[in-house]
Interface confidence: low
């Protein structure tokens, strides 16, 4: 199936040009998306091209600037947030990145009613997190690991917590491991729907071992970065959840929410918090051995000013074949009765589907079913449930948006997106206004991305928000590669693959093959999305065939494939890449003397193991920031899939699955190993240990480090990295420079 055909005709060939590496590094062919910042059922804010903050009313068709670019520029603001009562806007400047989601910033409050910045009781700096209450203009913020509350922006702050301490106690923000592997947010506080209560997490990292690495900077002596970072089997953070009444914060102070007894009996995690009403909250907990999750619904007791979590409102989710959930345990979407909810979890056939839980999980009503998976519940209204799935035409790498009418019986299902722009758009996400009165659809491909606005009642398209016309015009004279998404059936396993082919591809010729791999549990690489990236250039200009393969352990094709890697990472992911390569060779257009593999992070681990598999298939390969031993990686992630590195659990496979154990096998391949020295995520330690093992085995290899760079290798390092990898591959494939 050719998803993105090259628009090359013989008459046009002389005016068409191939992609260049410069195009990729300059972001010449990057696309834009439009996500409305909804502020009501029919209104949204958007930052215009000239940086004005504009309010759009869909129903009146009116738009006006609520905040000028002049005001934004006056404090060098890069972000903003309107208070729900629309009286104030916070302006965010001095952005300073910390980890994946976290950053600190300076905040200014602008009063829209008088057109001036709020003076007096200004916010301290730098702030770790700040947010408005859902109603009115209360402010909660985190400063130096403590939480503060302001009833109004100009008021003095009320200090909620006092025990916050750098790298020790975190209030309202996650520590490193919770940020990266559990919450996937920079915050750990949650307002109740009307702003009466504020819930927050406290993380105690006092006993966690610290990872320390040098940050070289420009000074005479390097700095040492210290991060409490629990590696597999190490001591974990201790988490507690508190709730405070924000109307009378000093009355009884923060009240702790009790942990379910079956969870509290051993090491555990808090996984998410969902407010149901102002006086009902839902917490999700997870055992350290991550196959048991408990959802606990708690109610406020006015008489005692405490939170009560009856056992009758505890719902257990357990996996007998793997870990609980997909990448994370799914979160509930509550219905209007404020007790029943919709949630995605595995059905009896091992496919993730939407279930409706009214009293117990055992009595759950299955809402969707089939040999495909429901992926996300976007919104539940009185009469509709909107979700995404990969059901349509049985392509796991697509995403379409569906509406189920839950107001009628039996519920009817409608695909909202399947036939809108069928060739151009097969991978959607959505963003809904209050009560799903309107929604935006963002299509990511396989054609050029497009964002559109729709009526939530009729699904009618109202207008195009962004169609990337400039990009479309810029691509008119570019010889883009062809892309195919197909599947291989091997030993009762379906291996979906994406192949990126040179523009003048001829099946009778032989081409060098590059495998790009990620392959981590619950990931998906074969997706019907648009991209003009490094591998597009390698196909377009350098004439390579590039393939991406989703093997065992990858997501959205059922639990059999997903949980196949449980407790044995590094085995089947590698086998399936190798199997696919053999199948590609059989297709007849691959030069089997010129096959390479590359990957980043988990992909660097898989590419390293594939190179060291002893098959003789690969001439060369690249590992960027690879994991080399699961004992070096974060507890929350690693133990989810591998269990504990103890003798009575899974230590043997921890030891057997290292890259270092296969050092000898690198002798007959060209290996390029790359890592940033300030990688907070996959520590440089991983590559240092690979390099040491290769040296000890007297195996030659190539390496590149990026000083003071993290896991993303951003900025000028990106250009250096891709230029360096390009030279390496061209040399490997004997392609002239």
């Amino acid at each position: 199936i050719v998803l993105r055909p090259s628009r090359v005709h013989n008459s046009e060939e002389n005016t068409m040009r191939a992609l260049t590496l410069k195009d990729i590094l300059n972001g010449t062919f990057s696309y834009k998306t439009f996500f409305p910042n909804w502020i009501s059922g029919q209104e949204y804010l958007h930052q215009s091209a000239d940086n004005n903050i504009v309010l759009y009313n869909i129903e009146t068709g009116q738009s006006y600037t609520i905040l000028s670019n002049r005001t934004m520029k006056s404090v060098n603001a890069s972000n903003y947030g309107l208070s729900p009562d629309r009286q104030f806007v916070y302006l965010e400047s001095d952005y300073s990145k910390l980890w994946r989601y976290s950053y600190t910033a300076t905040y200014y409050i602008y009063d829209l009613s008088n057109g001036e910045f709020v003076r007096g009781n200004e916010l301290p700096r730098p702030i770790q997190y700040l947010c408005w209450s859902p109603v009115g203009s209360k402010l909660a913020y985190v400063y130096q690991n403590n939480i503060y509350l302001k009833q109004r922006p100009g008021d003095p702050p009320f200090q909620i917590t006092f025990n916050g301490r750098e790298n020790k106690i975190f209030n309202g923000i996650p520590d490193w491991v919770y940020e990266e592997e559990m919450l996937a947010t920079k915050y750990a506080l949650w307002w109740s729907p009307n702003g009466k209560f504020l819930a927050y997490a406290e993380f105690n990292d006092t006993d966690i071992p610290v990872i320390a690495y040098s940050y070289y900077g420009d000074e005479q002596y390097p700095r040492t970065i210290n991060i409490p970072y629990p590696k597999a089997g190490a001591k974990n953070p201790v988490v507690r959840i508190f709730i405070i009444d924000t109307t009378y914060p000093a009355y009884v102070g923060p009240q702790e929410v009790p942990v379910p007894a079956m969870i509290a009996s051993s090491d555990y995690y808090f996984s998410w918090l969902t407010w149901v009403t102002d006086e009902r909250v839902c917490l999700q907990w997870l055992k350290r051995v991550q196959n048991v999750s408990v959802l606990s619904i708690c109610d406020f007791r006015e008489d005692w000013q405490t939170w009560d979590c009856p056992k009758t409102q505890e719902h257990i989710e357990e996996s007998r074949t793997g870990w609980a959930g997909g990448f994370f345990v799914s979160t509930p979407v509550f219905s209007y009765d404020a007790i029943s909810y919709y949630k995605i979890f595995s059905d009896k056939d091992g496919y993730k589907h939407i279930h409706y839980i009214k009293d117990t999980v055992e009595n759950a009503i299955q809402i969707t079913s089939g040999k495909w998976e429901a992926i996300n519940i976007f919104r539940v209204t009185q009469d509709s449930l909107f979700y995404s799935s990969n059901e349509f035409e049985e392509y796991p790498g697509r995403r379409n948006i569906y509406r189920i009418s839950i107001g009628s019986y039996p519920p009817s299902k409608k695909c909202v997106t399947c036939h809108l722009r069928k060739e151009r758009c097969q991978y959607y996400t959505a963003s809904f206004s209050d009560y799903a009165k309107y929604y935006a659809l963002v299509c990511y491909g396989p054609g050029i991305p497009i964002s559109t606005l729709h009526d939530g009642r009729t699904d009618q398209e109202i207008k195009i928000l962004e169609e990337n016309k400039e990009l479309e015009n810029a691509l008119k004279n570019i010889q883009l590669p062809k892309e195919e998404i197909k599947k291989l059936e091997v030993d009762e396993i379906t291996l979906w693959y994406k192949m990126i082919l040179p523009p003048q591809f001829d099946r009778s010729k032989k081409y060098p093959l590059l495998i790009q791999v990620y392959g981590g549990p619950c990931s998906q690489s074969v997706r019907s999305v648009f991209a003009v990236n490094w591998i597009s250039y390698l196909a377009s200009k350098e004439g390579m065939v590039i393939a991406l393969v989703d093997g065992r352990g990858t997501a959205f094709q059922g639990d059999k494939l997903l949980y196949a890697v449980y407790r044995k990472l590094g085995v089947y992911e590698v086998e399936d890449q190798i199997t696919a390569v053999r199948k590609f060779i059989e297709m007849g257009f691959i030069d089997e003397k010129r096959i390479a593999i590359w990957g980043w992070s988990y992909g660097g681990y898989v590419s390293s193991l594939a190179l060291a598999s002893g098959t003789g298939l690969f001439k060369c390969g690249i590992a960027v920031a690879p994991v080399s031993s699961w004992e070096y990686y974060a507890s929350v992630y690693t133990e989810r899939f591998m269990g504990l590195p103890t003798k009575d659990d899974n230590l043997e496979h921890y030891k057997n699955s290292t890259v270092m154990a296969r050092a000898e096998y690198f002798r007959n391949v060209d290996y390029l190993l790359i890592h940033g020295t300030a990688d907070d995520n996959v520590h440089f330690q991983n590559s240092a240990q690979i390099a040491k093992a290769l040296v000890n085995a007297q195996v030659d290899f190539q390496a590149m480090w990026y000083s003071d760079q993290n896991h993303g290798l951003s900025g000028l390092s990106t250009n250096h990295l891709y230029t360096h990898m390009t030279h390496f591959l061209k040399q490997c494939f004997s392609l002239s420079d």
Epitope: I39, S40, G41, Q42, E43, L55, N57, E59, T60, Y64, T65, I66, L82, D85, R86, Q87, L112, S113, V135
Partner: nanobody
Framework: QVQLQESGGGLVQAGGSLRLSCAAS????????MAWYRQAAGKQRELVAG???????NYAHSVKGRFTISRDNAKNTVYLQMNSLKPEDTAVYYC??????????WGQGTQVTVSS
Amino acid sequence: QVQLQESGGGLVQAGGSLRLSCAASLKISSINAMAWYRQAAGKQRELVAGIATDGRTNYAHSVKGRFTISRDNAKNTVYLQMNSLKPEDTAVYYCNQWPPRALDAWGQGTQVTVSS
């Protein structure tokens, strides 16, 4: 562009009551939030009370419990019932949508004077 006409102001003794009205030239049902503002001599304009389409209200600390905002979508009118008036409530009262539009969208306002 919506035209707004405020009325109902006047001179009143401290402790007295007034009901202000704001008539809009366009339907207000699709305007998410309407609000009353006031500006005392030599002071900045401030929000007094706001009301959203779903009926949720918001009041300045100084008027909470004394003033009540309401809206009649059928009549395209927003009201402000002011009880237990104090001298410090003396100001010109304006209505507008929330957040306020550009300066030219403001009405003439209605003067409220509370004598002690």
